[in-house]
């Protein structure tokens, strides 16, 4: 029961996390204009991984995509790659974990198979979460570096020296969404890995049962069956004697409310 709950909770937490990673990747507010130097600006700039936007005094927001691939900073490309890898791994992990859920019956899938799939999805979630956290952190580091490098005054203009305040950018909402989402995916993955340990059938330790044969006193101690972790192999420990103790697996093998969606 605890294993099922841990696995289910891990799945849900990872699902929320991956949804958050997707949302963060698509969001335009990875970096937003720092208003400290110019709190009265009527033109507000913010940028995402895929496009940059300007909200004007009329309330109109104009967004322009980065239509170049080669002209973009390598760091931005790296962040994009990390986020996409995170999404892809997370999506595959979700797909695998659906079939691994203990509360879902698919044919005669063995518990060892479900355990393996749970572990696989858990590892995928952990890597997915780490990719998202890394991507967001790289971008945040890039922002911090650029922020301190930006000079308060930059001289540009046509035919003369024109004073302008250079636009500086600070952390946007997407960074916080990404960090939280990555963390959730990571936590979900760890929970799946923990659930995997509970799902994997271990060596069954039967209580010793004494049978008194006439003239001899022999104690039979069954329990020399090692559980296989291979897909498709029969891992159920068979009863040795009709009156013997059932394995934990067999006690739970009757249909219960957890066996169906």
């Amino acid at each position: 029961m605890a294993v099922t709950a841990c696995q289910g909770l891990g799945f849900v937490v990872s699902l929320i996390g991956i949804a958050g990673i997707i949302a963060a990747t698509c969001m335009d507010q990875w970096s937003t204009q720092d208003l400290y130097n110019n709190p009265v600006t009527a033109v507000f700039n913010y940028q995402g991984l895929w496009r940059s936007c300007v909200r004007e005094s009329s309330g109109f927001t104009e967004c322009r995509g980065y239509f170049t691939l080669l002209g973009l900073p390598a760091m931005l490309q790296a962040v994009r790659a990390l986020m996409i890898v995170g999404i892809v791994l997370g999506a595959i992990g979700l797909l695998v974990s659906i079939f691994a859920l203990k509360c879902i019956r698919i044919g005669s899938m063995e518990d060892s198979a479900k355990a393996n799939m749970t572990l696989t999805s858990g590892i995928m979630f952990i890597v997915s979460g780490l990719c998202a956290i890394a991507g967001v952190s790289v971008f945040a580091n890039m922002l911090v570096t650029n922020f301190w490098m930006s000079t308060a005054n930059m001289y540009t203009g046509m035919g003369g020296m024109v004073q302008t305040v250079q636009t500086r950018y600070t952390f946007g909402a997407a960074l916080f969404v990404g960090w939280v989402a990555g963390g959730l995916t990571l936590i979900g993955g760890v929970m799946m890995c923990i659930a995997c340990r509970g799902l994997a059938p271990e060596e069954t330790n039967y209580k010793a049962v004494s049978y008194h044969a006439s003239g001899h006193s022999v104690a039979y101690k069954p329990g020399g069956f090692k559980a296989s972790t291979g897909f498709g192999s029969n891992t159920k420990n068979k009863k040795i004697y009709d009156g013997g103790a059932r394995t934990e697996d067999e006690v739970q093998s009757y249909p219960s409310k957890h066996d169906y969606v």
């Epitope: 009265v40 009527a42 009329s58 024109v162």
Partner: antibody, heavy 115, light 113 residues
Amino acid sequence: EVQLQQSGPELVKPGASVKMSCKASGYTFTNYFVHWVKQKPGQGLEWIGYINPYNDDTKYNEKFKGKATLTSDKSSSTAYMDLSSLTSEDSAVYYCLSLRFFAYWGQGTLVTVSA
Amino acid sequence: DIVMTQSPSSLTVTAGEKVTMSCKSSQSLLNSGNQKNYLTWYQQKPGQAPKLLIYWASTRESGVPDRFIGSGSGTDFTLTISHVQAEDLAVYFCQNDYSYPLTFGAGTNLELK
């Protein structure tokens, strides 16, 4: 066709208040801010402030804080400006304007403050 | 606040003539986010509301005749009317659309001889 239809002229006594309206049509009212501008007869233009009809967020020119109050009603696509404690200095034409780069202006509401 | 200074305050021209008016801002109106100058020009005819002519310092609003040309960047801007016509008699205002409070120039009054 985009239109900003303003309420008619107002003749008010000093110290009184006036509320003028600006009804928007031909575009999605909540997509653009509604700004208000003051123009004294034969003079230049002064920005009063704006209201975002989507969430009723407002921003005022410091000069008009306490003098003007901007509100809006999404259901009727109408923006309102309340002017309080009127003096002869407030006698002017008041315009509402909206859309990108303020492409559309109302016809103006003439407010005359006279005893 | 950004101060907008327009010159001259008044211009008297003959039809067909080329006319140039200037607008200077106390701070740059160039937005580095999209490399656009947030300066707008309006035309106000007597008894009417102002009409948008040019935005982003040089982009003509649709329907505005191509004789109206906006130029400049940063703090210095110019509105040029290549061949003035009788219907161009009006006051021309420039506006800072970059920083609050939004501010307008005092206007250039274009009169015909």
